[in-house]
């Protein structure tokens, strides 16, 4: 074969957001018949020559960016996309509130506000059943996530995290859940908490909609202001890991 071998995939199971002391398995998947896998933690000298890293109990020191590659004969593959393994529960939980309130009429506006008593400058909001959190960098003690023109799809359970840009893989515990209820519509939410996440959500800067490919990374975008997600069909498998999508401000 000419040229580099295709990149493998790297997954965190059951999730890439891992509470301290909980288990997680990183799994590198290449084509059948691979001679050797290498899984490495970036910005460190840690690596192992096997496809699976099992962590029985998550520690702060294990949070960070990981990638893997494989070797067939003398050829090495391209590296996998980076996986961001986040330790949660490192700091006390923030509070999440809805302005003007958690019950909103279809077509109305609502702002979800994540607030912490610490001086964190980063916040992440996620909705149960969605593939990744929205991230929102702000230099104060709280972050606002406006939802413009609410639809039934915005109904659901939300939580937020806070963290520092100095330690971007060490997050707080999740806030208590906030149930957003959209009234005046009979349409059911687009995703239920028990369903697997939809593979792709879209983003277009012009309409301030979110687009994130379905992978195991936590993405950050810096421009989006609304959290309207529109699912699209994809061949990507919605595996057992619960994924998260991100948002900047």
């Amino acid at each position: 074969q000419s040229g580099p071998l295709p990149k493998p995939s790297l997954q965190a199971l059951p999730s890439s957001l891992v509470p301290l002391e909980k288990p997680v398995t990183l799994r590198c998947q290449g084509p059948p018949g691979v001679d050797l896998y290498r899984l490495e933690k970036l910005s460190s000298s840690r690596y192992q020559d096997q496809a699976v890293l099992f962590i029985p109990a998550m520690k702060r020191s294990l949070a960070g960016r990981y990638r893997c590659s494989y070797q067939n004969g003398s050829l090495w593959s391209l590296p996998s996309d980076q996986l961001e393994l986040v330790a949660t529960g490192v700091f006390a939980k923030p509070s999440l509130s809805a302005q003007p309130g958690p019950a909103v009429s279809s077509g109305g506006d609502v702002t979800l506000q994540c607030q912490t008593r610490y001086g964190f400058d980063q916040f992440a909001l996620y909705k149960e059943g969605d593939p990744a959190p929205y991230k929102n960098p702000e230099r104060w003690y709280r972050a606002s996530f406006p939802i413009i023109t609410v639809t039934a799809a915005h109904s659901g359970t939300y939580r937020c995290y806070s963290f520092s840009s100095r330690d971007p893989y060490l997050w707080s515990a999740p806030s208590d859940p906030l149930e957003l209820v959209v009234t005046g519509t009979s349409v059911t939410p687009s995703r239920l908490p028990t369903e697997p996440p939809s593979p792709v959500a879209e983003f277009s800067e012009a309409t301030a909609e979110l687009t994130v490919s379905f992978t195991n990374e936590v993405f950050t975008t810096e421009t989006s202001r609304s959290i309207t997600a529109s699912p699209k069909e994809s061949d990507s498998p919605a595996g057992p890991a619960r994924q998260y999508y991100t948002k900047g401000n």
């Epitope: 288990p23 398995t25 699976v52």
Partner: antibody, heavy 119, light 107 residues
Framework: VTLKESGPGILQPSQTLSLTCSFS??????????VGWIRQPSGKGLEWLAH???????YYNTALKSRLTISKDTSNNQVFLKIASVDTADTATYYC????????????WGQGTTLTVSS | DIQMTQSPASLSASVGETVTITCRAS??????LAWYQQKQGKSPQLLVY???NLADGVPSRFSGSGSGTQFSLKINSLQPEDFGSYYC?????????FGGGTKLEIK
């Protein structure tokens, strides 16, 4: 894969219980393998006590942690559990069982050894 | 610690019937849950791992389902050898607590 527990059978209150799990068919030096201890008072449910992984990571039942010590002898295929200062409430059948991380379950169990604590 | 609440504590059923045992976790444990069967005077035996996967040698009349906090074990067309006690157990971070058990008796 087989596991077999051994213990003293009868102890008096305040004594230390020493249990041994001898196993064959797998090695505790294999990545992702662990052995745990579970007990069951007669007619009651199962209670997880302690666990040791291939890399010597050890985990304990929260309520009993101060009394438990788990260890292993990899070369002799043995895992040990000590319970300090036993009481009549520790009367139970004690099982050891294997965990392989991939299945996240106790996939093989020993036959159990019975302990009676009586003065 | 994560609590596992199993129900019912006991049930009576006849050979050929279908029964379902449920297990509820006090917090999200994803699919990191196992089911065991224990017969009188014997060691527990693994039935289901990772919530839905049948262990080797387990008959297909057994099935596990659920994820997150709600799980169930279903036994179709009960056979005489299925009577005994059943336990769920989570493995999502220690302590690895068991459910209280369900005693399945012949009606």
């Amino acid at each position: 894969v087989t596991l077999k527990e051994s213990g003293p059978g009868i102890l008096q209150p305040s004594q230390t219980l020493s249990l041994t799990c001898s196993f064959s068919g797998f090695s505790l030096s294999t990545y992702g393998i662990g052995v745990g201890w579970i007990r069951q008072p007669s007619g009651k449910g199962l209670e997880w006590l302690a666990h040791i992984w291939w890399n010597d990571d050890k985990y304990y039942n929260t309520a009993l942690k101060s009394r438990l010590t788990i260890s292993k002898d990899t070369s002799n295929n043995q895992v040990f559990l000590k319970i300090a200062s036993v009481d009549t409430a520790d009367t139970a059948t004690y099982y050891c069982a294997r965990v392989y991380y991939y299945g996240s379950s106790f996939d093989y169990w020993g036959q159990g050894t019975t302990l009676t604590v009586s003065s | 610690d994560i609590q596992m609440t199993q129900s019912p504590a006991s049930l009576s059923a006849s050979v050929g019937e279908t029964v379902t045992i449920t297990c509820r976790a006090s917090e999200n444990i994803f699919s990191i849950l196992a089911w065991y069967q224990q017969k009188q005077g014997k060691s527990p035996q693994l039935l289901v791992y990772a919530a839905t996967n049948l262990a080797d040698g387990v008959p297909s009349r057994f099935s596990g389902s659920g994820s997150g906090t709600q799980f169930s074990l279903k036994i179709n067309s009960l056979q005489p050898e299925d009577f005994g006690s059943y336990y769920c157990q989570h493995f999502y971070g220690t302590p690895w607590t068991f459910g209280g058990g369900t005693k399945l008796e012949i009606k």
